[in-house]
Amino acid sequence: MMTGTIETTGNISAEKGGSIILQCHLSSTTAQVTQVNWEQQDQLLAICNADLGWHISPSFKDRVAPGPGLGLTLQSLTVNDTGEYFCIYHTYPDGTYTGRIFLEVLESSVAEHGARFQIP
């Protein structure tokens, strides 16, 4: 039975040209995290494999940095970066947990972070 929950940074906004950290945290389970995949609308951004380390997709090498932790840093943001991001935790023995973050990239300097929320 999957008992864990994913806590994410929720709905967030950031300024065009700036950077943002996407963070997820898996709690309430003793399952071992074997890999975390980061996706943007079905497109792979990055992989963090427990044994093999990080892979940043070639399409995003110039604008994506690994970390902190299992998180991901997006740099040089554009309005086109607005959208859904997913952290997919592959665990043993539980299986897969998915967290969702919605990022809005704003033209103006009015960029406030949304509240944290949980996805079971």
Epitope: N37, N49, H55, I56, S59, K61
Partner: antibody, heavy 122, light 113 residues
Amino acid sequence: EVQLVQSGAEVKKPGSSVKVSCKASGGTFSNYWIGWVRQAPGQGLEWIGDIYPGGAYTNYNEKFKDRVTITADKSTSTAYMELSSLRSEDTAVYYCARGDYYDSSGRAMDYWGQGTLVTVSS
Amino acid sequence: DIVMTQSPDSLAVSLGERATINCKSSQSLLYSRNQMNYLAWYQQKPGQPPKLLIYWTSTRESGVPDRFSGSGSGTDFTLTISSLQAEDVAVYYCQQYYSYPYTFGGGTKVEIK
């Protein structure tokens, strides 16, 4: 030792499709990319695309994007490359290869299948 | 797409002599985060699949003789065979794996003079 074993040679008619398989053993199939490269007779190497089975993420060379589909079956550790609307220029040896593109190892295409000759002829 | 240009197309070298193959990319292959160049070299003998020789510009794959070495950074790279052996007769390809689509050089045929 990682091994990639490909399906046998194929002779196809123009306009038809071919599906080549690549069965992996001796490694963790889901954790590495499986890429496809072709080589026309007497020519160089051309990258077609790849798949990361641990998420079924695919990347295609734009040249082939409308005609190629790369899939993977984790349960059998087998990757597939299907090329449609075949023409005589597609006659080539098709290779699968394991890709290691992690930032800490980055060994590129380190293990290769034996190749599958696809002949397109009317 | 990143264009990989190899030179020369073919090379004839005496046994025991040095063979040098050049590869030039149309864009830098240096990844600033880990300071690695995403450039590999392969050897292909007739009727066989390519074999990985060197990755990240200069790291020899396990089991590859130390007479093979790679160097370079950014856009200019070199594969050197310090003392050519009969079994080194093959076609050599460079490949970039920095950005999609991954691309290969046109190949350099190495023969014995």
